[in-house]
């Protein structure tokens, strides 16, 4: 299996909520010896490799904002300690998980990474990582909504969402 | 604070049976799959049991595997070691680690000392 | 099982100089490696993951690379609560294994 990340670049205005998607891709076993590790850390572009450090998401760490299911399975982060710091992982029966990140300030900007690892019986586990980078922006050059920008392309989309409230 | 505490450890006979506890705080320990790692006096490290956080899966080092069964009790923030038919190769400290898929063991008990003896 | 082999099994240096102790694996854990190091009478401490990444807290004096087989931990100016045991792990394939440990001590 591999994780598709469908945008590589959120650009957001200060005060906004983000969504922040991967997506699982491939033939995902849904046995009974197969569950899946899903978690959010923030990074740095590494010279050896990206997403190889994993530093906290608003002081919190990959630990604390952990999926942990079968399949394709749906579950989502009911941690008050994430929901404190305006912050909720979530995934679908669809392979899809994302991390919504609420009322950004300039500091949330840096690289964001989805970790996935598949959990095999008696099997050496399987990791794989997805990058992509949020730019929060302030001042007049700001955007009014969050705009993204797909992987494939550097065709960009607007989010239409207002300020403090929920998109995607 | 966030800790681990073993119990349990002291000097038993070959064949003999001891039952280890490690005691989790400070963290959701529902949340952390878990390990047993044991050291032989004035030895290395050696990786004894493993548990999900759900209770399974559960994997066993061959040279324990039949004789140690390694459960939790996620409502008392509790794992636990049965240890049967003990050997003399099995005198160690016997450490409780928090692990997680794709992660390491980042958080250790001081260990209980087994030791086995006649 | 996969094999670790720590080299030298001990360092005698002094408090400044800089300490480079070696893990080879018996066959290839990617990047999915760990240093710890381990005082007498304490449990061990998460120094490194995943070959190169100072877990929290880890001073910059430590430092670590490699991938497949061939690992380094290196402590650049050794400070007196430095001198300890250091041992590689691996998880890349069950069971997980340890090196047996390199000790540096003072000289």
């Known amino acids: 299996f591999k994780v598709a990340t469908p945008y590589s670049l959120y650009v957001c205005p200060e005060g906004q909520n983000v969504t922040l998607t991967c997506r699982l891709l491939g033939p995902v076993d849904k046995g009974h010896d197969v569950t899946f590790y899903k978690t959010w850390y923030r990074s740095s572009r590494g010279e050896v490799q990206t997403c190889s450090e994993r530093r906290p998401i608003r002081n919190l760490t990959f630990q604390d904002l952990h999926l942990h299911h079968g399949g394709h399975q749906a579950a989502n982060t009911s941690h008050d300690l994430a929901q404190r710091h305006g912050l909720e992982s979530a995934s679908d029966h669809h392979g899809n998980f994302s991390i919504t990140m609420r009322n950004l300030t300039l500091l949330d900007s840096g690289l964001y990474c989805c970790l996935v690892v598949e959990i095999r019986h008696h099997h050496s586990e399987h990791r794989v990582h997805g990058a992509m980078e949020l730019q929060v922006q302030t001042g007049k050059d700001a955007p009014s909504n969050c705009v993204v920008y797909p992987s494939s392309s550097q065709e960009s989309e607007n989010i239409t969402a207002h300020h403090h409230h929920h998109h995607h | 604070q966030v800790q681990l505490v073993e119990s349990g450890g002291g000097l038993v006979k070959p064949g003999g049976s001891l039952r280890l506890s490690c005691a989790a705080s400070?963290?959701?320990?529902?949340?952390?799959?878990m390990s047993w790692i044991r050291q032989a006096p004035g030895k290395g490290l050696e990786w004894v049991s493993y548990i999900s956080n759900s209770g399974s899966p559960i994997y066993y080092h061959d040279s324990v595997k039949g004789r140690f069964t390694i459960s939790r009790d996620n409502a008392k923030n509790s794992l636990y070691l049965q240890m049967n038919s003990l050997r003399a190769e099995d005198t160690a400290v016997y450490y409780c680690a928090r692990d997680l898929p794709g992660w390491y063991f980042d958080l250790w008990g001081r260990g209980t000392l087994v030791t086995v003896s006649s | 099982e996969i094999v670790l082999t720590q080299s030298p099994a001990t360092l005698s240096l002094s408090p400044g100089e800089r300490a480079t102790l070696s893990c080879r694996a018996s066959q290839s854990v990617s990047s999915y490696l760990a240093w710890y190091q381990q005082k007498p009478g304490q449990a061990p401490r998460l120094l490194i993951y995943d070959a190169s990444n100072r877990a929290t807290g880890i001073p910059a004096r430590f430092s670590a690379s490699g991938s497949g087989t061939d690992f380094t931990l290196t402590i650049s100016s050794l400070e007196p609560e430095d001198f300890a045991v250091y041992y590689c792990?691996?998880?890349?394939?069950?069971?997980?294994?340890f090196g047996q440990g390199t000790k540096v001590e003072i000289k």
């Open positions: 400070g963290f959701t320990f529902s949340d952390y799959y």
């Open positions: 792990q691996q998880r890349n394939n069950w069971p997980r294994t």
